[in-house]
């Protein structure tokens, strides 16, 4: 695998990533010569994060927000080297990819799972949601599917209008000019959109972490 572009802005860090980084620094200070058992360290970090109050997490959330702003600022002026097609510039004004029926279902039930099982990892929450969805009757998936179809239709109209208007300069600069067939271009966009959806779900997970103390 070739090394990525060294000029490319560093990826944005989540609040949890900042917390882990702080944990690591603290650990290094206390035990400068000790080697770190990664899985044990991760487990301890995760446990600590779960018991932290929203106020304590606030500091790391502010760091994440500032880093996100930094990343977006740097990405606006970043021009990928020729031949790099993956991860094109993302225009913040571009229509958001619509959520799937399953995604809509997840946003309904995720708070309950996380509230009742605060110790579950993001992966386990996702697994539980998948199981719930699989055991939901087709009839009761229908409303989610109808809404997802409506949102998809709206997205298709919006994206058509957006393309017709033409992308902003910064976006044009960021995209490799080599002409691709329309099909290939759309495939790439879909791929990128799927990544967006995953990223959004992760962000949502982080955002919701502090909203679980309702009761």
């Amino acid at each position: 695998m070739g090394k990525g572009d060294p000029k490319k802005p560093r990826g944005k860090m989540s609040s949890y990533a900042f917390f882990v980084q702080t944990c690591r620094e603290e650990h290094k200070k206390k035990h400068p010569d000790a080697s770190v058992n990664f899985s044990e360290f991760s487990k301890k970090c995760s446990e600590r994060w779960k018991t932290m109050s929203a106020k304590e997490k606030g500091k790391f959330e502010d760091m994440a927000k500032a880093d996100k702003a930094r990343y977006e600022r740097e990405m606006k002026t970043y021009i990928p080297p020729k031949g790099e097609t993956k991860k094109k510039f993302k225009d913040p004004n571009a229509p958001k990819r619509p959520p799937s029926a399953f995604f809509l279902f997840c946003s309904e039930y995720r708070p309950k799972i996380k509230g009742e099982h605060p110790g579950l990892s993001i992966g386990d929450v996702a697994k539980k949601l998948g199981e719930m969805w699989n055991n939901t009757a087709a009839d009761d998936k229908q409303p989610y599917e109808k809404k997802a179809a409506k949102l998809k239709e709206k997205y298709e109209k919006d994206i058509a209008a957006y393309r017709a208007k033409g992308k902003p300069d910064a976006a044009k600069k960021g995209v490799v000019k080599a002409e691709k067939s329309k099909k290939k271009k759309e495939e790439e966009e879909d791929e990128e959109d799927e990544e967006d959806e995953e990223e959004e779900e992760d962000e949502e997970d982080e955002d919701e972490e502090e909203d679980d103390d309702d009761e």
């Epitope: 809509l104 009757a137 309702d214």
Partner: antibody
Framework: EVQLLESGGGLVQPGGSLRLSCAAS????????MLWVRQAPGKGLEWVSY????????NYADSVKGRFTISRDNSKNTLYLQMNSLRAEDTAVYYC?????????????WGQGTLVTVSS | DIQMTQSPDTLSLSPGERATLSCRAS???????LAWYQQKPGQAPRLLIY???TRATGIPDRFSGSVSGTEFTLTISSLQPDDFATYYC????????FGQGTKLEIK
């Protein structure tokens, strides 16, 4: 302790309307899907309608589609059933129930029910 | 729609006896989405069993559920006076349908 308390039942003429309420307590209402189930006098149980935790998704039995509307107010911990164009066959005890999941879906808590009588 | 047929309609037994209630689905049902409820006159139904065989919280172990193909069975190993009531099975594979109920009465 989980509690569900229905109200709003009564005697109504065919073609009339009624709004049932179900006040929930003892749990985080906004986490759960809720349902209405009815039972005609001396008969079995019949599912009427379902609503998702946020209220964004609903479903109805064919027998009430277009006439009944389920809704919820999570800030008030209350579930509603607006019943319009009522018919004699809608006469029943209406129960609200909490719908839960634990490796399968089921109704784990029910209210005591409110009687709706449609008669002229 | 899936029909749930319970048998028998009425079951007359004495306390201490074993009760076997049957519920048959008109088509395949995900056993995870089958539940049994008990209802006494003038009261709301109470969840007994979910997932075909898992007892709900606080339900005594004399109640058990099993499945064989499209046939679901609720067994009460040794009837107590409090167990005489109407029992409903309910599937959730396509909407929510209940069986017509089995009335368990004292002989």
């Amino acid at each position: 302790e989980v509690q569900l308390l229905e109200s709003g039942g009564g005697l109504v003429q065919p073609g009339g309307s009624l709004r049932l309420s179900c006040a929930a307590s003892g749990f985080t209402f906004s986490w759960y899907s809720m349902l209405w189930v009815r039972q005609a006098p001396g008969k079995g149980l019949e599912w009427v309608s379902y609503i998702s935790p946020s209220g964004g998704f609903t479903n109805y039995a064919d027998s009430v589609k277009g006439r009944f509307t389920i809704s919820r107010d999570n800030s008030k911990n209350t579930l509603y059933l607006q019943m319009n164009s009522l018919r004699a066959e809608d006469t029943a005890v209406y129960y609200c129930a909490r719908w839960d999941y634990n490796s399968g879906w089921y109704y784990d808590h029910w209210g005591q029910g409110t009687l709706v009588t449609v008669s002229s | 729609d899936i029909q749930m047929t319970q048998s028998p309609d009425t079951l007359s037994l004495s306390p201490g006896e074993r009760a076997t209630l049957s519920c048959r689905a008109s088509q395949s049902v995900n056993s995870r989405n089958l539940a049994w409820y008990q209802q006494k006159p003038g009261q709301a139904p109470r969840l007994l069993i979910y997932g075909a065989s898992t007892r709900a919280t606080g339900i005594p172990d004399r109640f058990s559920g099993s499945v064989s193909g499209t046939e679901f069975t609720l067994t009460i190993s040794s009837l107590q006076p409090d167990d005489f009531a109407t029992y409903y099975c309910q599937q959730y594979n396509s909407y929510f349908t209940f069986g017509q109920g089995t009335k368990l009465e004292i002989k």
